[in-house]
Amino acid sequence: MNGRVDYLVTEEEINLTRGPSGLGFNIVGGTDQQYVSNDSGIYVSRIKENGAAALDGRLQEGDKILSVNGQDLKNLLHQDAVDLFRNAGYAVSLRVQHRLQVQNGPIGHRGEGDPSGIPIFMVLVPVFALTMVAAWAFMRYRQQL
């Protein structure tokens, strides 16, 4: 049985203190520039080396930021969200959603040396080949009618 990639979503409150160069990360998203399809949320796109966020270590690229100092980031233009961060105080409280990729395999014990799942291309290539063969056979059959 093949492994299946799922996501474990967890939330965390991260309190950051502005360093000499600020909070030290970039964001994407907003109602005017959706980063994720059908989601106007705000996501971390880059964490700057040696910035406050990098030194704290909890905020990760790809994390979704739900609120800043208790203020919801839903339905904000990108620039309004940026403003909210820039004009926040010295101590900034972030409510963050992490998406952890987890491998869901068959029920039962998986040995330490076992692979954690089959790469997707190893499944797709045979499926694609079979589809092509079936299509070819169907076309030949139609020609004979």
């Epitope: 160069s21 600020g22 796109s45 990108h78 620039q79 940026v82 820039r86």
Partner: nanobody
Framework: QVQLVESGGGLVQAGGSLRLSCQAS????????MAWFRQAPGKEREFVAA????????YYADSVKGRFTISRDNAKNTVYLQMNNLKPEDTAVYYC??????????????WGQGTQVTVS
């Protein structure tokens, strides 16, 4: 590189007024958001006011609402902070900050050296 130069600070009596100016120079500056922050002795730097265009937005800290007014002259790349009804607790070094208009950083990109405001 962008340089920010503040001016207009000084000593003023409580209830008085001051007008701070901050001029941005440097070929890379593109009329992005600009702001004023302040830092009182022994305290952390705090946000005072910010202004941006496209779309136009103006923000104030609760402690200065109704007393301070931020404005800008895009042709001169200058932002102003008109401070009225000053109080002793407004005493601080006032810093100007600016960001490039397309920056996605959650921090201001440039900072001035600061100008001292003392309210007696």
């Amino acid at each position: 590189q962008v340089q920010l130069v503040e001016s207009g600070g000084g000593l003023v009596q409580a209830g008085g007024s001051l007008r701070l100016s901050c001029q941005a120079s440097g070929r890379t500056f593109d009329s992005g958001p600009m702001a004023w922050f302040r830092q009182a002795p022994g305290k952390e730097r705090e946000f005072v006011a910010a202004i941006r265009r496209s779309p136009e937005r103006i923000y104030y800290a609760d402690s200065v609402k109704g007393r301070f007014t931020i404005s800008r002259d895009n042709a001169k790349n200058t932002v102003y902070l008109q401070m009225n009804n000053l109080k002793p607790e407004d005493t601080a070094v006032y810093y100007c900050a600016a960001a490039l208009s397309r920056s996605t950083s959650v921090d201001y990109d440039y900072w001035g050296q600061g100008t001292q405001v003392t309210v007696s």
